[in-house]
């Protein structure tokens, strides 16, 4: 899996999107987890509604929300009031039984200031950014 970088500004909200094949993952709940080290499990932050048909309902855990468009095939995670310690490596997961498939690896970066972006010469807007080597980033 390539890693997609999402950059947000401290104190603001950041929306992370994870596209997936809606047919392949039909009937599966989704989750958002945080990788706390090179090895070790991905620590669950929040998961979609226990009833798959209600996956469109937004579920919160603290300042993190998850909602799933099961027809369109897009999982959306919202990080509200972003703080520096929210930065890290995360995964969007598709759950089946006790197993989990990785839909997308996401690197969340929290900047002190929008102009702290690595290409600060250009005006930058929060969200997905441009491409770095093996990390994929989109505007």
């Amino acid at each position: 899996h390539n890693t997609t970088v999402f950059q947000g500004v401290a104190g603001q909200s950041l929306q992370v999107s994870c596209p997936y094949d809606s047919m392949k993952h039909w009937g599966r709940r989704k989750a958002w987890c945080r990788q706390l080290g090179e090895k070790g499990p991905c620590q669950r932050v929040v998961s979609t509604h226990n009833l798959w048909l209600l996956s469109f309902l937004r579920r919160w855990n603290g300042s993190t929300a998850i909602t799933d468009d099961t027809l369109g095939g897009t999982l959306t995670i919202t990080l509200r009031n972003l703080q520096p310690h929210d930065a890290g490596l995360y995964q969007c997961q598709s759950l089946h039984g006790s197993e989990a498939d990785t839909l997308r690896k996401v690197l969340v970066e929290v900047l002190a200031d929008p102009l702290d972006h690595r290409d600060a010469g250009d005006l930058w807007f929060p969200g997905e950014s441009e491409s770095f080597e093996d990390a994929h980033v989109e505007h």
């Epitope: 970088v5 520096p84 310690h85 930065a87 890290g88 900047l111």
Partner: antibody, heavy 121, light 107 residues
Framework: ELQLQESGPVLVKPGASVKMSCKAS????????MNWVKQSHGKSLEWIGV????????SYNQKFKGKATLTVDKSSSTAYMELNSLTSEDSAVYYC??????????????WGQGTLVTVSA | DIQMTQSPSSLSASLGERVSLTCRAS??????LSWLQQKPDGTIKRLIY???TLDSGVPKRFSGSRSGSDYSLTISSLESEDFADYYC?????????FGGGTKLEIK
């Protein structure tokens, strides 16, 4: 063994620039944030800024914006900090301090030995 | 910016004594606080993170606790190598800020 080896002491003239280094070893350099901290003689510590070596993204303490520039060289696992337009106020020991996995969510577990910068005519 | 008010600024104590240092945060930091030890040669070592989690290899005589916006570092029985400078660090929000430090000296 994890090590952060900082460059040696420097004596520079007012108005000049200085670029110090912090060579990391014993871990995957791009997986961990790198912070820089200033300690003036007999004073407390001040956070300058942080860089994510994987993407090069930086965040600075507003106080050091325009004064410090953080960069990395992934090929040599080295972080750099350049200070410009030096004055006597910039005379201090500067530390690099490694963060946690793609973040600083547990603070700064590892510190370099510090680089002494003396600004004097 | 979040101000970290550290007290006392200096402390004289004897070997075997129990001492406590405190940092008060001017805003909520939700436990995102660590304690650092700086030896006279400038070497800095993290002792505690997340307010109360002891770093591996740090003696158990060190402990961290929280009461509201007050964070404490306690050394239960001072040993000779504990005489050093101590700083708290908040990493809850930018810019990260340090306490003014406590100089722990031998009585």
């Amino acid at each position: 063994e994890l090590q952060l080896q900082e460059s040696g002491p420097v004596l520079v003239k007012p108005g000049a620039s200085v670029k110090m280094s912090c060579k990391a070893s014993g871990y995957t350099f791009t997986d961990y944030y790198m912070n820089w901290v200033k300690q003036s003689h007999g004073k407390s510590l001040e956070w300058i800024g942080v860089i994510n070596p994987y993407t090069g993204a930086t965040s600075y303490n507003q106080k050091f914006k325009g004064k410090a520039t953080l960069t990395v060289d992934k090929s040599s696992s080295t972080a750099y900090m350049e200070l410009n337009s030096l004055t006597s106020e910039d005379s201090a020991v500067y530390y690099c301090a490694r963060g946690t996995y793609y973040s600083n969510y547990e603070g700064f577990p590892y510190w370099g030995q510090g680089t002494l910068v003396t600004v004097s005519a | 910016d979040i101000q970290m008010t550290q007290s006392p600024s200096s402390l004289s104590a004897s070997l075997g004594e129990r001492v406590s240092l405190t940092c008060r945060a001017s805003q909520e930091i939700s436990g995102y606080l660590s304690w650092l030890q700086q030896k006279p040669d400038g070497t800095i070592k993290r002792l505690i993170y997340a307010a109360s989690t002891l770093d591996s290899g740090v003696p158990k005589r060190f402990s961290g606790s929280r009461s509201g916006s007050d964070y404490s570092l306690t050394i239960s029985s001072l040993e000779s190598e504990d005489f050093a400078d101590y700083y708290c660090l908040q990493y809850a929000s930018y810019p990260y800020t340090f306490g003014g430090g406590t100089k722990l000296e031998i009585k």
